[in-house]
């Protein structure tokens, strides 16, 4: 494959990274296979700056992460390691809660209203966030 | 690497009580749930009580509520179980565990007079 | 609270056989169900979360499946360290419940 030097359209790039933002809502699973359909992976926010710019352009609204602990230990979807890596969970969270009465506890991270991060049930259709390294080899062959 | 590692069982007079301890470690405590479950010699697996990553919501088996209270130090990566008014249907090993995935090797607890 | 009805409470089976163990929850509990492995004196170990999906680490002759109140745990081809116990855990709500065990034997 080819190496990616610009964004696709309607992709924000910022530092060295293409940014794709929703504006319909999916469960957690279903905006994760959009993101992989498009070559991408669901945004994973590796320091304040990156966590900034991406509430900047979501805006107060809940939106998908690429963090969950559906097997176990929290994850991010690309690998990057969570315990050593960036955090901004609000106060109190995560706390797993099980008392929305939908079954099961809350296994999926969102950015919520004031950016900071919560986990809830990844079957709630909220926004979601792609993300692509620009420097990551396209999966499109290259043009003769 | 994950670690949990239980200490504090022994053997008690019925009526008595133990603290339990789960010092826990290779991980971010104060993202998970942790859970407290026990069997009894030659018996089944029994979940016993379960509290939230932070805020503290905490749940318990019929058998041993208003018995049992079970806590965290999220600063000192501690989970412990306060057990009071001890029965003999008490005695098991007593497993802390990490949400529903990671378990520790457990402690026993004996309760005989 | 959700009782976990698991069967068979025993089996005997050989080296290269597929098992399987059932467990029926007494209502829906969508997917929120995992199987446990218990070596005698050792701590459980999980193999499977969200009633199909493999731990990592645990060989891929271990399956499961199902969702709502039935699922089953299969084991494709025994292997020696096979024989041991087996129980299934729903986490759907509290209090989380465990199957009684099923003891996979020798024949």
């Known amino acids: 494959g080819s190496e990616r030097t610009c964004c696709p359209v309607n992709w924000v790039e910022h530092e060295r990274s293409c940014y794709w933002f929703s504006r319909s809502g999916k469960a957690w699973a279903d905006a994760d296979n959009y993101c992989r359909l498009e070559d991408a992976h669901l945004v994973v926010v590796t320091s304040w700056e990156e966590q900034k710019f991406v509430q900047h352009h979501i805006g107060p609204v809940n939106t998908w992460m690429g963090l969950h602990d559906q097997n176990g230990p929290w994850k991010w979807v690309d690998g990057t390691d969570y315990e050593t890596g960036f955090k901004n969970w609000r106060p109190e969270q995560p706390d797993d809660w099980y008392g929305h009465g939908l079954g099961g506890g809350e296994d999926c991270a969102h950015f919520t209203d004031d950016g900071r991060w919560n986990d809830d049930v990844c079957q709630r259709p909220y926004r979601w966030v792609c993300e692509t390294e620009l420097d990551k080899a396209s999966q499109e062959p290259p043009l003769l | 690497e994950v670690q949990l590692v239980e200490s504090g069982g022994g053997l008690v007079k019925p009526g008595g009580s133990l603290r339990l301890s789960c010092a826990a470690s290779?991980?971010?405590?104060?993202?998970?749930?942790m859970n407290w479950v026990r069997q009894a010699p030659g018996k089944g697996l029994e979940w016993v009580s379960s509290?939230?990553?932070?805020?503290?919501?905490?749940y318990y088996a019929d058998s041993v509520k208003g018995r049992f209270t079970i806590s965290r130090d999220n600063a000192k990566n501690s989970l412990y179980l306060q057990m009071n008014s001890l029965r003999a249907e008490d005695t098991a090993v007593y497993f802390c565990a990490r949400d529903k995935d990671y378990w520790g090797q457990g402690t026993l607890v004996t309760v005989s007079s | 609270d959700i009782q976990m009805t698991q069967s068979p409470s025993s089996l005997s089976a050989s080296v290269g056989d597929r098992v399987t163990i059932t467990c029926r929850a007494s209502?829906?509990?969508?997917?929120?169900l995992g199987w446990y492995q218990q070596k005698p004196g050792k701590a459980p170990k999980r193999l499977i979360y969200a009633a199909s999906s493999l731990q990592n680490g645990v060989p891929s002759r271990f399956s499961g499946s199902g969702s709502g109140t039935e699922f089953t745990l299969t084991i494709s081809s025994l292997q020696p360290e096979d024989f041991t116990t087996y129980y299934c855990?729903?986490?759907?709500?509290?209090?989380?419940?465990f199957g009684q065990g099923t003891k996979v034997e020798i024949k």
């Open positions: 855990l729903q986490h759907n709500s509290f209090p989380w419940t």
């Open positions: 509290i939230s990553s932070s805020t503290g919501y905490m």
């Open positions: 209502q829906d509990i969508r997917n929120d």
């Open positions: 290779g991980f971010t405590f104060s993202s998970y749930r």
